[in-house]
Interface confidence: low
C-alpha cells in the first residue's frame, strides 16, 4: 500500500477512502511533494497582506504587504508599518529620530551618526535625521579650531525589540 502512495505526484494526495487512488488536491489546497496523504490548505493573503503568487495545486500562495507596510519574518509571515526616513517605529507609532541618530529607510531603527574622530577624521557634512554625517580629512589637515561631532549613542527605549 505504501508503494502505491509513493506514486502519487505533487498536486495529488493518496486517498485512503478510495483504495490508495491518487486524487487531485481539492480547490484551495496543494501538495508540493509526492506521496502525500493529505493536501495542505492554501495560505490566504488577507487584511494587510496581498497576494504575490496565487496558490496552485503544487505550491502554496505567497503573500506580500499592502502599500504602507513591509514584510517581516519567514515567508512574509507578518507586515510591519512603514515609517518615513528620519523616523523609527515605536509602540506609539512612528517617531522622529533623536538628535545624533538617523534612519535612511522606511523600516528599521535610528542609528547613531558615524563618529568621524574615531577614524581621525572630521565632519565634512553634518548629519540629519535622514542621513549620516559625511567624514572628511583629518582635523590636522584643516584650520585650527575644526572639530568633529561625536554625539553619544542614544539609549534604546526598553521596548526596542525586546525579544
Amino acid at each position: 500500500l505504501q508503494d502505491l502512495c509513493s506514486n502519487c505526484p505533487a498536486g495529488t494526495f493518496c486517498d485512503n477512502n478510495r483504495s490508495q487512488i491518487c486524487s487531485p488536491c481539492p480547490p484551495n489546497s496543494f501538495s508540493s511533494a509526492g506521496g502525500q496523504r493529505t493536501c495542505d490548505i492554501c495560505r490566504q493573503c488577507k487584511g494587510v497582506f496581498k497576494t504575490r503568487k496565487e496558490c496552485s495545486s503544487t505550491s502554496n500562495a505567497e503573500c506580500d504587504c499592502i502599500s504602507g507596510y513591509h514584510c517581516l519574518g519567514a515567508e512574509c509571515s507578518m507586515c510591519e508599518q512603514d515609517c518615513k526616513q528620519g523616523q523609527e517605529l515605536t509602540k506609539k507609532g512612528c517617531k522622529d529620530c533623536c538628535f545624533g541618530t538617523f534612519n535612511d529607510q522606511k523600516r528599521g531603527i535610528c542609528r547613531p551618526w558615524t563618529n568621524c574622530s574615531l577614524d581621525g577624521k572630521s565632519v565634512l557634512v553634518n548629519g540629519t535625521k535622514e542621513r549620516d554625517v559625511v567624514c572628511g580629512p583629518s582635523p590636522a589637515d584643516l584650520s585650527p579650531g575644526a572639530s568633529s561631532a561625536t554625539p553619544p549613542a542614544p539609549a534604546r527605549e526598553p521596548g526596542h525589540s525586546p525579544q
Epitope: L72, G73, A74, S77, M78, E80, E88, L89, T90, K91, R107, G108, I109, R111, R156, P158, G159, H160, S161, P162, Q163
Partner: antibody
Framework: QVQLQQPGAELVRPGASVKLSCKAS????????INWVKQRPGQGLEWIGN????????NYNQKFKDKATLTVDKSSSTAYMQLSSPTSDDSAVYYC??????????????WGQGTTLTVSS | DIKMTQSPSSMYASLGERVTITCKAS??????LSWFQQKPGKSPKTLIY???RLVDGVPSRFSGSGSGQDYSLTISSLEYEDMGIYYC?????????FGGGTKLEIK
C-alpha cells in the same frame, strides 16, 4: 532555508568559562537580533539577553549580567554566549533564537536545536 | 521584572475537548504577549503573538485572547499532536519574562 545551528552538547568543569555558539545561515545575519534562552531540566524558560549583529548592541536580563557575555562574529555569521565561572546552576539547555530588526508584534521565528551544557568535574 | 503567573501548571484533557490555559501578568502588558508550545526534547514553537494573532501555519483551533493583565490560550478541539508544554511570554518590558508553563496531557 533559515537555520540556527548549535552544538548538541558541551561539557565544562566548574569554574572554567565556556563559549556556546550559534551559527546562522539562510538569511542576512546582521539584520536580525539573536536571543539566548535558558531552560533547566524539567523547568521553564528564561530570557538571558539579545544582540544585534549589525552593531553588536546588547540587552541583558539583569539576572545574567555578570554571568553571560554575548558577542558575534559577522564574518562567520556566528553568535556566541560566554558563561563565566560556571556552576551546577548553569547546567541547562541553551537555545539561540532570532527576531527581526524592529518589530513590536514580535515572535521568535526560528530557533536553534539547543545546546545541553553540563557543568561537572 | 514583570511576573507571569500561568495556570494550571498541568492538566489532562480528552481528544476533541475545549482547553483553556491562562496567564496573569503582575502589571498591564498592553497585549504584548506570545504563547509557545514545546514538545519533549524540542525547541519551543510560537503559536500566538500580540495576545491574539495567530502565527502563519499554526492551526486555527488555537486562539488567544485577553488584555491588560489577563490572557488566555484556547484550543477549540484538542488533537493528539497538541500535547506538550505551553508557555506564555510578555515582551512589553525588558527583560521578557515567561510563565511557568502548563503541561497538557491526553486523558
Amino acid at each position: 532555508q533559515v537555520q540556527l545551528q548549535q552544538p548538541g552538547a558541551e561539557l565544562v568543569r566548574p569554574g572554567a568559562s565556556v563559549k556556546l555558539s550559534c551559527k546562522a545561515s539562510g538569511y542576512t545575519f546582521s539584520s536580525y537580533w539573536i536571543n539566548w534562552v535558558k531552560q533547566r531540566p524539567g523547568q521553564g524558560l528564561e530570557w538571558i539577553g539579545n544582540i544585534y549583529p549589525s552593531d553588536s548592541y546588547t540587552n541583558y536580563n539583569q539576572k545574567f549580567k555578570d554571568k553571560a557575555t554575548l558577542t558575534v562574529d559577522k564574518s562567520s555569521s556566528t553568535a556566541y554566549m560566554q558563561l563565566s565561572s560556571p556552576t551546577s546552576d548553569d547546567s541547562a539547555v541553551y537555545y539561540c533564537t532570532r527576531t527581526w530588526e524592529f518589530y513590536y508584534d514580535s515572535v521568535f521565528d526560528y530557533w536553534g536545536q539547543g545546546t545541553t551544557l553540563t557543568v561537572s568535574s | 521584572d514583570i511576573k507571569m503567573t500561568q495556570s494550571p501548571s498541568s492538566m489532562y484533557a480528552s481528544l476533541g475537548e475545549r482547553v483553556t490555559i491562562t496567564c496573569k501578568a503582575s502589571q498591564d502588558i498592553n497585549s504584548y504577549l506570545s504563547w509557545f508550545q514545546q514538545k519533549p526534547g524540542k525547541s519551543p514553537k510560537t503559536l500566538i503573538y500580540r495576545a491574539n494573532r495567530l502565527v502563519d501555519g499554526v492551526p486555527s483551533r488555537f486562539s488567544g485572547s485577553g488584555s491588560g493583565q489577563d490572557y488566555s490560550l484556547t484550543i477549540s478541539s484538542l488533537e493528539y499532536e497538541d500535547m506538550g508544554i505551553y508557555y506564555c511570554l510578555q515582551y512589553d518590558e525588558l527583560p521578557p519574562t515567561f510563565g511557568g508553563g502548563t503541561k497538557l496531557e491526553i486523558k
